[in-house]
């Protein structure tokens, strides 16, 4: 229902305070009363949150898919819906709450995890993975001098990744979605492990290029685990650290 | 083609209060985010408000609480209540969107609000 | 806020002369790998027309003579040679942060 879509987008985690624009200082964003959230920004005004608005499940939270609210409703408005448990119809595997995955149209345990999780995560923050829906609905009614096949450059407004050119997301900034750069090994990104994670920020990054995957930065002097940067790592880093 | 037009625009007391619409058409007006910007007589430009495809509302300071953004998508409208209106608040008000770049590319002719006793 | 200032207040040229505006921010208004910066066109009793985003990318249907350029802090809109309907007020506008904000506007007349 229309209200349990609410409640699993009700209040979501804003991006990290570092690494650029994500975190402004001296902002904050109001979302319900006496609850603060620094990073965002004091010019946002949140009445009553509205579901976020999605073209592909990489951009809902690790719990959540993209669909329209609606059996059978306008494929143009879909918003993040919250996971399928077990048993539960499906129609693709990222419809499955995590630790499952869709199989003859049913949400079924994963025993090896081999769907969700860090594996899918890795696959979604690839570069080129663009799962973009096909939705129905095209961009403008009327393209004014835009020409339909036209590829959005840094900057423009886009609906979904597929919107932008090569090498470039599409992505959530203040009041549009746009354009932004693919990020480079090195950078900072944004690793959404929460439900729902990217429904409050204003200032979402891209995934991480092809190649790349956003893991903690490993960073032996550093004592607190909850400090560590994500960013985005060439693949064949990946190691099993022993914990003695 | 994308058009925006403005109406609702005239002369309101001090402390009186005013309702601007903006009636859109040639695009998927849910899908993209709508703003108001105003020009007082003479002068630049300055930002009034904005509210996305989602539905956030943005606010400056100078305005915060005395002014609503609202939209209506089943009818392609866009809604500026102003409350407590001031004197400072006489201008030209453009409604604009950001349909093809994270600008405001596509502006109405503007309505004009005078707040004079 | 973030403050534009474009200088210089008005630009005094002839038709086919080249137009160097510039807008100066007082933070970067970089950030993602984009400069979010916008350039507008005003002559009087219209709206605002939209040039330049992002720095550097011409707007729908926007003649070639119209470009710009910079990062960080200092952007430049070029007006490579003015035709008699360039003759307008130019803003520059920020779209880091909220508030969006303009520059005070340079004026380019006829001389």
């Known amino acids: 229902t229309l209200n349990s879509v609410l409640n699993s987008n009700a209040i979501k985690n804003l991006p990290p305070p570092l690494g650029g624009a994500a975190g402004h200082p001296g902002s904050a964003v109001s979302a319900a009363p006496g609850i603060l959230y620094p990073g965002g920004n004091k010019y946002q005004t949140i009445d009553n949150y509205q579901p976020y608005p999605c073209a592909e499940d990489e951009e809902c939270g690790t719990d959540e898919y993209c669909a329209s609210p609606t059996r059978g409703g306008d494929a143009g408005v879909q918003i993040c819906l919250a996971c399928r448990k077990r048993r539960k119809r499906c129609m693709r595997h990222a419809m499955c709450c995590p630790g499952n995955y869709c199989k003859n149209g049913i949400c079924v345990s994963s025993d090896q995890n081999h769907f969700r999780g860090e594996i899918e995560e890795t696959i979604t923050e690839s570069f080129g993975n663009d799962h973009s829906t096909l939705d129905g609905y095209s961009r403008r009614t009327t393209l004014s001098s835009k020409m339909y096949h036209t590829k959005g450059q840094e900057g423009s407004v886009c609906l979904r990744s597929s919107d932008c050119a090569s090498g470039l997301c599409c992505a959530r900034h203040f009041w549009s979605k746009i354009c932004k750069p693919v990020l480079k090994e090195g950078q900072v990104c944004t690793k959404h492990r929460r439900k729902g994670s990217h429904g409050l920020e204003i200032f979402q990054r891209c995934y991480c290029g092809e190649g790349l995957s956003c893991r903690i930065q490993k960073d032996h002097h550093q004592a607190s685990n909850s400090s560590r940067l994500h960013t985005c790592q060439r693949h064949h880093h990946h190691h099993h650290h022993h914990h003695h | 083609e994308v058009q925006l037009v403005e109406s609702g625009g005239g002369l309101v007391q001090p402390g009186g209060s005013l309702r601007l619409s903006c009636a859109a058409s040639?695009?998927?007006?849910?899908?993209?985010?709508i703003s108001w910007v105003r020009q007082a007589p003479g002068k630049g430009l300055e930002w009034v408000a904005s509210?996305?495809?989602?539905?956030?509302?943005y606010y400056p300071d100078s305005v915060k609480g005395r002014f609503t953004i609202s939209r209506d998508n089943a009818k392609n409208s866009l809604y500026l209540q102003m409350n407590s209106l001031r004197a400072e608040d006489t201008a030209v008000y453009y409604c604009?969107?950001?349909?093809?770049?994270?600008?405001?590319?596509?502006w109405g002719q503007g309505t004009t609000v005078t707040v004079s006793s | 806020e973030i403050v534009l200032t474009q200088s210089p207040a008005t630009l005094s040229l002839s038709p086919g002369e080249r137009a160097t505006l510039s807008c100066r921010a007082s933070e970067s208004v970089d950030d993602f790998g984009i400069s979010f910066i916008n350039w507008y066109q005003q002559k009087p009793g219209q709206a605002p027309r939209l040039l330049i985003y992002?720095?550097?990318k011409q707007g729908s249907g926007i003649p070639a003579r119209f470009s710009g350029s910079g990062s960080g802090t200092d952007f430049t809109l070029t007006i490579s040679s003015l035709e008699p309907e360039d003759f307008a007020v130019y803003y520059c506008?920020?779209?880091?942060?909220?508030?969006?904000?303009f520059g005070g506007g340079t004026k380019v007349e006829i001389k």
């Open positions: 509210v996305s495809g989602w539905g956030d509302t």
């Open positions: 604009a969107s950001s349909l093809d770049n994270y600008a405001f590319d596509y």
């Open positions: 506008q920020q779209l880091k942060e909220v508030p969006p904000t």
């Open positions: 040639g695009f998927t007006f849910s899908s993209y985010a």
């Open positions: 992002a720095g550097s």
